[in-house]
Interface confidence: medium
Amino acid sequence: MERRRITSAARRSYVSSGEMMVGGLAPGRRLGPGTRLSLARMPPPLPTRVDFSLAGALNAGFKETRASERAEMMELNDRFASYIEKVRFLEQQNKALAAELNQLRAKEPTKLADVYQAELRELRLRLDQLTANSARLEVERDNLAQDLATVRQKLQDETNLRLEAENNLAAYRQEADEATLARLDLERKIESLEEEIRFLRKIHEEEVRELQEQLARQQVHVELDVAKPDLTAALKEIRTQYEAMASSNMHEAEEWYRSKFADLTDAAARNAELLRQAKHEANDYRRQLQSLTCDLESLRGTNESLERQMREQEERHVREAASYQEALARLEEEGQSLKDEMARHLQEYQDLLNVKLALDIEIATYRKLLEGEENRITIPVQTFSNLQIRETSLDTKSVSEGHLKRNIVVKTVEMRDGEVIKESKQEHKDVM
């Protein structure tokens, strides 16, 4: 069996002259009975590996790969063109020889016929060989066209995959940057909210202190058992959790990028695995994108949760402050009403004092009258024997305007014939 190397592209054509029919075979004509055509094994498309590492390495690797692909394509095109040229040349030769043969056949047989017979046999044999060769070259050309189409399609697919991978990579970088910016933004927000809470807490504490001082002055003890919300601790805990999450995500992303770049750089030489790995990587990227999207959604969720907690804390704080204000207003109203009542009582007591003074004067007058009468008349007169005098005295302990506690003592003295026969004391403790 005759073996012939076709090109340097490591592909062999196995051509068996024994299998090829040695008979008149021209393009367009069928291979005769008993013909076996041994086909050239076409080269597999030359796979290439695109390097997806860092931008610089990527460009260099890709340029190199593209250059080798271009060179391969040019070689395939050149081979293709040379096959076509060979076929055309052989076809022309066939035509010329066929025409020559027909001319010879058309001529009348002469004495020279025998002389040319051997030459004619040789020419026919050569024509058959050329026809068979032409058919084989045509098959090779078609097979090469098929391989070329496969290579081109694969190259297109791989270029698309590379572009997709680059776009994905850019998208991941952007996502990572956005996540970092979002984290920083959230940290700033948290800080400003903490600052605001500290400020509100300070105001709240001052208001409470002020209220306590006012209440102490008015000697009204109102105890409000309200637990102060420990906002700072809660926020610190939430912030710690968030930072841990964000840091973990960042480290994971960085680690992933580093390992991915290393993997892709190492894989640049493994041309035969390009399509499989590119697709596998594309799926990985998609999964990573989904994972990063989930992480991002989770962070957004955490952020929303934090903001919701902050809003709730603020609302709670506002509600508590409002309740303190209401309590204070209520106390002030009650205090005012107590003051008014006290003033009313004081007025009443003043009136009673006036009555008492009037009575005291009257009693003193009666006493004097009685004493005068006793001196003048030796016989005692029983005019006032049944007279009952009730002496009421009002003792008020110092009424200080600053205090709302009053002690009122009402003393009742019952006298008959100038003698005290009954004395009673009533003490009123008024608390307002």
Partner: antibody
Framework: EVILVESGGGLVKPGGSLKVSCAVS????????MSWVRQTPEKRLEWVAS???????YYPDNVKGRFTISRDNARNIMYLQMSSLRSEDTAMYFC??????????WGQGTTLTVSS | DIVMTQSHKFMSTSVGDRVSITCKAS??????VAWYQQKPGQSLKLLIY???YRYIGVPDRFTGSGSGTDFTFTINSVQAEDLAVYYC?????????FGTGTKLELK
């Protein structure tokens, strides 16, 4: 997108003739060799004929002289003219892109039934 | 003629399994072998050519190997959509010939 569509199949009596066609799109038809492959009712695959881009034809012995493959590069159509049909020619006939090589793309097939 | 023999007409497998289909040529065909997939009621689809090269758009779970007379087609992790008939084909010399086919079924 590469598309190959066969047509012209049907029921034929033994000894009869039939011409099936394969219309193609999605690639430069004139650059590629084309073939016909059939699948018997028992699901066996058999190569029927091939034609190179330049028009050279190739057949296995069992159809040689009875079947003729041809192509019209201007209309992007390939044909298979079948004559002296036998019951063993009953099959699903597929057209495929590729000559004496691997077949990268296949049509959906057209059915030929040879029966009296 | 070169005869392509697929020893197993049927092969049982489960989703996720690794399965290998063999094909033996009656004489040396170098690496001029292709593998095709045919799903019920459908046309054929080229998966592997030149014994070990995946065709355009073919998932990487499909692999081919061998040269000379012994060839193997492997599915690394069988998916439900891989249940079909698989044919080997030699294009080393005319007449072009095909294997009898191996039907992949679920256990």
């Amino acid at each position: 997108e590469v598309i190959l569509v066969e047509s012209g199949g049907g029921l034929v009596k033994p000894g009869g003739s039939l011409k099936v066609s394969c219309a193609v799109s999605g690639f430069t038809f004139s650059n590629f060799a084309m073939s016909w492959v059939r699948q018997t009712p028992e699901k066996r695959l058999e190569w029927v004929a091939s034609i190179s881009s330049g028009g050279t034809t190739y057949y296995p012995d069992n159809v040689k002289g009875r079947f003729t493959i041809s192509r019209d590069n201007a209309r992007n159509i390939m044909y298979l003219q079948m004559s002296s049909l036998r019951s063993e020619d009953t099959a699903m006939y597929f057209c495929a892109r590729g000559g004496l090589h691997y077949f990268g793309y296949w049509g959906q097939g057209t059915t030929l039934t040879v029966s009296s | 003629d070169i005869v392509m023999t697929q020893s197993h007409k049927f092969m049982s497998t489960s989703v996720g399994d690794r399965v290998s289909i063999t094909c033996k040529a009656s004489q040396d065909v170098n690496t001029a072998v292709a593998w095709y997939q045919q799903k019920p009621g459908q046309s054929l689809k080229l998966l592997i050519y030149s014994a070990s090269y995946r065709y355009i758009g073919v998932p990487d779970r499909f692999t081919g190997s061998g040269s000379g007379t012994d060839f193997t087609f492997t599915i690394n992790s069988v998916q439900a959509e891989d249940l079909a008939v698989y044919y080997c084909h030699q294009y080393y010399s005319t007449p072009l010939t095909f294997g009898t086919g191996t039907k992949l079924e679920l256990k």
